[in-house]
């Protein structure tokens, strides 16, 4: 009679993550009498995945009765599988022996290979918010998939951005891997909407990539910008002057109005109005008693937006020449107009 | 948490025996390989013997004859059994757990055997 | 027997710099080449396997490579937790499990 052989079918078997594998294996022969074991690896170091004599082993079950005596089939299935479970697994035919069992054949063994999904992408931007005009770097992060195969890409509101460096790892064969991204967006005025968008495609989701998001609202910062004008006379002798704070994101800011270097009001901004970009506007003013004042007073209207340094506009008002209806851009009232950074 | 502990270190004279232990927990003992490396003072690391799930034993050729590896599989302990011990013995003996890969990826803390006259 | 040949004995380093080091096998082992770091007084611990497959847990700045019979660490940027004795050994399906000699790192 020809010599028992351990058939194993299969060279590799793919399966995804969570799902049954099915290691077949049959014998040719009943004899010699003994059991069969199934282990992950070769040599000494092997692992025992099943041993039909004795032991626990909850996630396989058998496809046959393996009590059965004329039973040749040894195939095994395997519950939830994870990327742990990749490797090459043999299936092993032992001779009955005293007091040992003894090695008889082994199988040629069938690599399991095990696909699973990346994790939905994470994107994470800057620590600090950054100014229009300026570079920042978002980064996307995926991990846990199976195989190393993977395609990710940056969008910006739709359109793809080509600035950006990829890295799997491990570089060498894993049971699972991981993807990071760096991307560099640059920001501009009208970016308060926009998002920033990585996607990643892989075999495992059929066509339907995984995308994460990172709102640029939590990144950028538009700084205001500042017009001060005097109004028509209100009575007699007082003059209305505003602080037009234009364009400005995020909301917090807080306005100090300064006569001649002094400070007569500070207020936050509350009652905002929204721009369709996104940005703010906000209006602030100040009634100035002109009789109050023998000499031309310097009206400044300084903001600090955001916890940064304050900037500042200026305005002189004549007291000298009789108040009048006028706007502010009349050459008389706007001479002593300028910009300056308060530190 | 897998853990192993090594007990059984001591001071003994050449010639002398000693037999350590290596308590496992935290994995599956009979599924896995186990082994035993040592480290002499201020050296570097010796592989010195294995034992496999089916019970096959292997050993470095410093102590083939002289040491003998045994696993109790109810109890999820490692012995090294050391006879005839010599001077160039004197080492940390380290029991770890053997991946299917052959490397070995959960080590104890060791047990320090002193052999000296 | 297969003899695991590292170079060098000692590196000196700075926290934060590239740390490279290499293990020379005398006959061919494939990729199957580990490497383990132990400091004073603590059992080693599995870094890399394969030549180039990070063990679970350990950092993304710990990277190997395989040129032939010739294998390097490589640690992108040392902290001060790297600064440790580094051991190759090769894991082919037989034993004996050779180690090589070790590379020391320490602070410059």
């Known amino acids: 009679e020809e010599e028992l052989q351990v058939i194993q079918p299969d060279k590799s078997v793919l399966v995804a993550a969570g799902e049954t594998a099915t290691l077949r294996c049959t014998a040719t022969s009943l004899i010699p009498v003994g059991p069969i074991q199934w282990f992950r690896g070769a040599g000494p170091g092997r692992e025992l995945i099943y041993n039909q004599k004795e032991g626990h082993f909850p996630r396989v079950t058998t496809v046959s009765d393996l009590t059965k005596r004329n039973n040749m089939d040894f195939s095994i299935r395997i519950g939830n599988i994870t990327p742990a479970d990749a490797g090459t697994y043999y299936c092993v035919k032992f001779r009955k022996g005293s007091p040992d069992d003894v090695e008889f054949k082994s199988g040629a063994g069938t690599e399991l290979s095990v696909r699973a999904k990346p994790s939905a992408p994470v994107v994470s931007g800057p620590a600090a918010r950054a100014t229009p005009q300026h570079t920042v770097s978002f980064t996307c992060e995926s991990h846990g998939f199976s195989p190393r195969d993977i395609t990710l890409k940056w969008f910006k509101n739709g359109n793809e951005l080509s600035d950006f460096q990829t890295n799997v790892d491990p570089v060498g064969e894993s049971v699972s891997y991981s993807i990071h991204s760096t991307a560099k967006v640059v920001l501009t005025r009208e970016d308060v909407h926009s998002q920033v968008i990585c996607e990643v495609a892989h075999v495992t989701l059929q066509g339907d990539p995984l995308r994460g998001t990172a709102n640029l609202s939590e990144t950028i910062r538009v700084p205001p910008t500042l017009e001060v004008t005097q109004q028509p006379v209100r009575a007699e002798n007082q003059v209305n002057v505003t602080c037009q704070v234009r364009k400005f994101y995020p909301q917090r800011l807080q306005l100090t109005w300064l006569e001649n270097g002094n400070v007569s009001r500070t207020e936050t901004a509350s009652t905002v109005t929204e721009n369709k970009d996104g940005t703010y506007n906000w209006m602030s003013w100040l009634l100035v008693n002109v009789s109050a004042h023998r000499d031309d007073v310097k009206l400044t209207c300084q903001v600090e937006h955001d916890g940064q340094p304050a900037v500042s506009k200026s305005h002189d008002l004549k007291v000298s020449a009789h108040p009048k209806e006028q706007g502010s851009n009349t050459a008389a009232e706007n001479t002593g107009s300028n910009e300056r950074n308060i530190y | 948490d897998v853990q192993l502990v090594e007990s059984g270190g001591g001071l003994v004279r050449p010639g002398e025996s000693l037999r350590l232990s290596c308590a496992a927990s935290?994995?599956?003992?009979?599924?896995?390989?186990v082994t035993w490396v040592r480290q002499a003072p201020g050296e570097g690391l010796e592989w010195v013997s294995l034992?496999?799930?089916?019970?096959?034993?292997y050993y470095a050729d410093s102590v083939k004859g002289r040491f003998t590896i045994s696993r109790d599989n109810s109890k999820s302990t490692l012995y090294l059994q050391m006879n005839g011990l010599r001077a160039e013995d004197t080492a940390v003996y380290y029991c770890?757990?053997?991946?299917?890969?052959?490397?070995?990826?959960?080590w104890g803390l060791g047990t320090l055997v002193t052999v000296s006259s | 027997e297969i003899v695991l040949t590292q170079s060098p004995g000692t590196l000196s380093v700075s926290p934060g710099e590239r740390a490279t080091f290499s293990c020379r096998a005398s006959?061919?082992?494939?990729?199957?080449l580990a490497w383990y770091q132990q400091k004073p007084g603590q059992a080693p611990r599995l870094l890399i396997y394969d030549a180039n497959t990070r063990a679970t847990g350990i950092p993304a700045r710990f990277s190997g490579s395989r040129s032939g019979t010739e294998f390097t660490l490589t640690i992108s940027s040392l902290q001060s937790e790297d600064f440790a004795v580094y051991y190759c050994q090769q894991h082919t399906d037989w034993p004996p499990y050779t180690f090589g000699g070790g590379t020391k790192v320490e602070i410059k």
């Open positions: 034992i496999s799930v089916t019970g096959t034993t």
């Open positions: 006959q061919t082992v494939g990729s199957k």
């Open positions: 935290g994995f599956t003992f009979t599924n896995y390989a």
């Open positions: 770890a757990k053997v991946t299917w890969k052959n490397v070995f990826d959960y």
